[in-house]
Interface confidence: low
């Protein structure tokens, strides 16, 4: 039967069953995706817009697939095989109760059932595994697949490689609270702060718990993955995003055409091949660029190098550097610098550092 | 160019029914989540109701509930508002509305980005 | 459900003048925009979440705010700036939708 010919699939949540909380729907979905990837070399990561390999949809009766659902018990669920299209979909029968638990249909458990078809899975006849056609619920806090169920996925998709093992792209706890977590570039984007990370980045609401991960890629298609550094200028609707010796613009949230750009436009000697970092601050406009282990600050209103720069990081951010990895602006007086999975809010009005934090602390961690 | 045209408005008695259609031109209608918002002669906005992109989740204002549908058909690029057990405070032109904003970004704004030019409905015995 | 206020009702200034809206909801929202409505017409987007003008519109427009208090600023008023403005925001989950009453800009 097919299969997926390659090892990065994405899904999307087309829409949500009013069963459940929202965040239980994309908690058990992204949980029934990670079973398959602990014992494969695929990697699940959700998105949020355009076409994804994988579409999940709640709906009832006739759906438009030739496969109208039969309402409450019968089919739970369906799915199909890997392709493009409505191959790999996994369609759920909105007149069932879907729940988080032993009640009604517990979603995690269908799911991973429907995701094993969405791989390329028929069903087994071995009724501890969870291709078996009939649905039972089992505790979902001890679920293991079956040797079975494993035999016929590796069989597909061979084990997971160690040495393959990405960072984690959907965003499971272990991931976003892994205490030795860092970020390539950080930056504010009105009352948001964007966390970048290889290929992904993680967006924060201000004073709001909740923080989704996301594809660089399916927010801005033209953009690279590996975003090194990022800056803001909010009064203009402005962001910076830079890697290796180029930089995007981004206004109202839309990339700029005639980008990338070389970052030497901004004034930088040729010895200057990346940045590590970047901040702007509104209350002197200028921009503050992290290269290795020293600083230039770029006067954004007559759009030149301030003259005396480079300085050296430590000389005169105390407590920080020598290098960093990201920071941003906020509050009106802080720096965020971030150096590998530490933290450090510094207040540039008393220029010093007033606390120290994980990377993560942003994510309720 | 992205244009929406609403029609089916009209006059239409206390308790009657009416079905308003909006025709989308110009981009692709099935990408984007819809919206029907109300303007009550020299009053403000009313948001009556909104349906995703694919048709599933419809969402209406506690005013209309359980009078009013709302439904899509992606094949034809139209958007519908069947109005049933009209009231006399229903009366107000009907506006269509394109959701814009990265859907990406949805938890965190949404916007209309493309309105039509309205229809009149007035509800009077 | 969240309330929408706009003050002031109405706006009496002259061609030239700056115009300073305000919007405040009765709970904190993050995802506000801000529309203009011309007599007869059908409203327009100016500025979506919070401070991003939409496509087309000049810069004499600006949005700012957060939490509960939101302004539109008009830096100098041009004859077309004279109309009705509104404020909305959104609820997503559930979802709920509110627009404000309304500030009508006049000529003085």
């Known amino acids: 039967g097919p299969v997926w010919r390659k090892h990065y699939i994405t899904y999307r949540i087309n829409n949500y069953t009013p069963d459940m909380n929202r965040e239980d729907v994309d908690y058990a979905i992204r949980k029934a995706f990670q079973v398959w990837s602990n014992v494969t070399p695929l990697k699940f990561s959700k998105i949020n817009t355009g076409m994804a390999d994988i579409l999940v949809v709640f709906a009832r009766g006739a759906h438009g697939d030739f496969h109208a659902f039969d309402g409450k018990g019968g089919i739970l669920a369906h799915a199909f095989g890997p392709g493009s299209g409505i191959g790999g979909d996994a369609h759920f029968d909105e007149d069932e109760f879907w729940t988080t638990h032993s009640g009604g249909t517990n979603l995690f458990l269908t799911a991973v059932h429907e995701i094993g078809h969405s791989l390329g899975l028929g069903h087994s006849s071995d009724p501890k595994a969870v291709m078996f056609p009939t649905y039972k619920y089992v505790d979902i806090n001890t679920f293991r697949l079956s040797a079975d169920d494993i035999r016929g996925i590796q069989s597909l998709y061979g084990d997971p490689k160690e040495n393959q093992r990405l960072p984690n792209p959907d965003n499971s706890e272990p991931a976003l609270c892994d205490p030795n977590l860092s970020f390539d570039a950080v930056t504010t984007v009105g009352n948001k702060i964007f966390f970048f990370k290889d290929r992904f980045f993680w967006l924060k609401v201000s004073e709001r718990p909740k923080t989704s991960v996301n594809l660089i890629s399916s927010l801005w298609p033209t953009l690279p993955s590996g975003i090194e550094a990022a800056y803001e200028i909010e009064a203009r609707n402005q962001v910076f995003l830079f890697k290796d010796d180029k930089y995007w613009l981004i206004s109202n949230l839309r990339p700029e055409p005639n980008y990338p750009k070389s970052i030497h436009s901004f004034g930088f000697p040729n010895f200057v091949k990346k940045i590590d970092a970047a901040v702007f601050n509104p209350r002197f406009y200028r921009t503050y660029f992290f290269v290795d282990n020293q600083y230039w600050r770029y006067d954004e209103r007559r759009q030149m190098m301030d003259p005396g720069y480079p300085k050296l990081i430590t000389k005169n951010f105390q407590g920080i550097g020598p290098k960093i990895d990201a920071v941003f602006y906020s509050k009106n007086k802080y720096y965020y610098f971030f150096q590998g999975s530490n933290q450090f809010e510094y207040d540039f009005l008393l220029q010093r550092i007033t606390k120290t934090l994980k990377s993560n602390s942003w994510f309720g961690c | 160019e992205v244009q929406l045209l609403e029609s089916g408005g009209g006059l239409v008695q206390p308790g009657g029914s009416l079905r308003l259609s909006c025709a989308a031109s110009?981009?692709?209608?099935?990408?984007?989540?819809m919206d029907w918002v109300r303007q009550a002669p020299g009053k403000g906005l009313e948001w009556v109701s909104g349906?995703?992109?694919?048709?599933?989740?419809?969402y209406y204002a506690d005013s209309v509930k359980g009078r009013f549908t709302i439904s899509r058909d992606n094949s034809k690029n139209t958007l519908y508002l069947q109005m049933n057990s009209l009231r006399a405070e229903d009366t107000a032109v009907y506006y269509c509305?394109?959701?814009?904003?990265?859907?990406?970004?949805?938890?965190?704004?949404?916007?209309?980005?493309?309105w039509g030019k309205g229809t009149t409905v007035t509800v009077s015995s | 459900d969240i309330q929408m206020t706009q003050s002031p009702a109405t706006l009496s200034l002259s061609p030239g003048e700056r115009a300073t809206l305000s919007c405040r909801a009765s709970?904190?929202?993050?995802?506000l925009a801000w529309y203009q409505q011309q007599p007869g017409q059908a409203p327009r987007l100016l500025i979506y979440?919070?401070?991003y003008r939409a496509t087309g519109i000049p810069a004499r427009f600006s949005g700012s705010g957060s939490g509960t208090d939101f302004t539109l600023t008009i830096s100098s008023l041009e004859p077309e700036d004279f109309a009705v403005y509104y404020c909305?925001?959104?609820?997503?989950?559930?979802?709920?939708?509110?627009f404000g009453g309304g500030t009508k800009v006049e000529i003085k």
């Open positions: 349906i995703s992109s694919s048709g599933g989740p419809t």
């Open positions: 709970h904190s929202v993050d995802n």
């Open positions: 979440d919070v401070s």
């Open positions: 909305q925001q959104r609820n997503n989950w559930p979802l709920s939708l509110t």
């Open positions: 509305a394109r959701v814009g904003g990265w859907e990406l970004l949805q938890d965190y704004y949404y916007y209309m980005d493309v």
């Open positions: 110009g981009f692709t209608f099935s990408a984007y989540e």
